[in-house]
Amino acid sequence: QEGPLPRPSISAEPGTVIPPGRPVTIVCRGPVGVDQFRLEREDRSKFNDTKDVSQASPSESEARFRIDSVSEGNAGHYRCLYVKSTRWSEHSDYLDLVVKETSGDTDSPVTEPDSSAGPTQRPSDNSHNEHAPASQGLSAEHLY
């Protein structure tokens, strides 16, 4: 029928090194027409699905998976895959989420700007996605 589905990509906002207790959003991207994204842990035994899919660019769709407050249990390797026209894609590359204090001195408070308002707005007129803050997204318990 059609050729192989494009491989999804995976990224994290604000980054892949997150201090404990802070939020992180894992972003999965694929082509337009993706029905469902799945975020998996490395052993495949734990995953989270969403059908809340929207525009990332004229040629891409995306889904966002938020962990409100990361802990050591959230550290590890994540990857995405998706369903389009009843077919599963290949997996994305692995994303390595590291949970640790980002300042050199772990006794001092974290001084980076608070990212709890959600992901940074991308420059574009944006989608019906509109990158609304996801401040009540998936907690660690919900995800895994």
Partner: antibody, heavy 119, light 107 residues
Framework: EVQLVESGGGLVQPGGSLRLSCAAS????????MNWVRQAPGKGLEWVAR??????????FYADSVKDRFTISRDDSKNSLYLQMNSLKTEDTAVYYC??????????WGQGTTVTVSS | DIQMTQSPSSLSASVGDRVTITCLAS??????LGWYQQKPGKAPKLLIY???SLAEGVPSRFSGSGSGTDFTLTISSLQPEDFATYYC?????????FGGGTKVEIK
């Protein structure tokens, strides 16, 4: 089988209020974005409002024509979508459809509920 | 806001005819375009999503093409059940706008 059943339509005077409901079944409601679309008598389709999932903090979006008058909400525990309509105008007279996304597109529609705004 | 201009607004055709409906977006929307069919007194039905993908259960005589700003819905051989109104919709940015519709009538 996906089912979306709207209710709450009726006759209301200009300036009045109505609350539409949509009962969803046959799919996992809480992982889907949901929408309201309307169609005035003899006219085309008009998107009204959209609500996203918990992953997006239930973000809401509205057509300019209903902004500040209509409120979309959802109750995932009840598999239900709502549209609170205040300060109704005669031009809000339409059939209102509850619509579920698939792949970001409007794949599943309810049968519609009729709202008539008239004095 | 992105305007969607559909043409023609109506057309008359016979069973077996090839029918083409076009939709023009006022700015680029990539392939974030859907086509819907609506019959009188019924809810719309998704025919094509992502500009070219056939929705579940839709006959293969329906096809979509285009990307960017220019899109086409084609019915390769019109059947009696295809007489209806067709709408395009952009889902690239809010507000999620529809075209004005094309009514396909029996000649």
């Amino acid at each position: 089988e996906v089912q979306l059943v709207e209710s709450g339509g009726g006759l209301v005077q200009p300036g009045g209020s109505l609350r539409l409901s949509c009962a969803a079944s046959g799919f996992t409601f809480n992982i889907n974005a949901m929408n309201w679309v309307r169609q005035a008598p003899g006219k085309g389709l008009e998107w009204v409002a959209r609500i996203r999932t918990k992953n997006y903090n239930y973000a809401t979006f509205y057509a300019d024509s209903v902004k500040d008058r209509f409120t979309i909400s959802r109750d995932d525990s009840k598999n239900s979508l709502y549209l609170q309509m205040n300060s109704l105008k005669t031009e809000d007279t339409a059939v209102y459809y509850c619509v579920r996304d698939r792949a970001g597109f409007f794949a599943y529609w309810g049968q519609g509920t009729t709202v008539t705004v008239s004095s | 806001d992105i305007q969607m201009t559909q043409s023609p607004s109506s057309l008359s055709a016979s069973v077996g005819d090839r029918v083409t409906i076009t939709c023009l977006a006022s700015q680029t929307i990539g392939t974030w375009l859907g086509w819907y069919q609506q019959k009188p007194g019924k809810a719309p039905k998704l025919l094509i999503y992502a500009a070219t993908s056939l929705a579940e259960g839709v006959p293969s005589r329906f096809s979509g093409s285009g990307s960017g700003t220019d899109f086409t819905l084609t019915i390769s051989s019109l059947q009696p059940e295809d007489f209806a109104t067709y709408y395009c919709q952009q889902l690239y940015s809010t507000p999620l706008t529809f075209g004005g519709g094309t009514k396909v009538e029996i000649k």
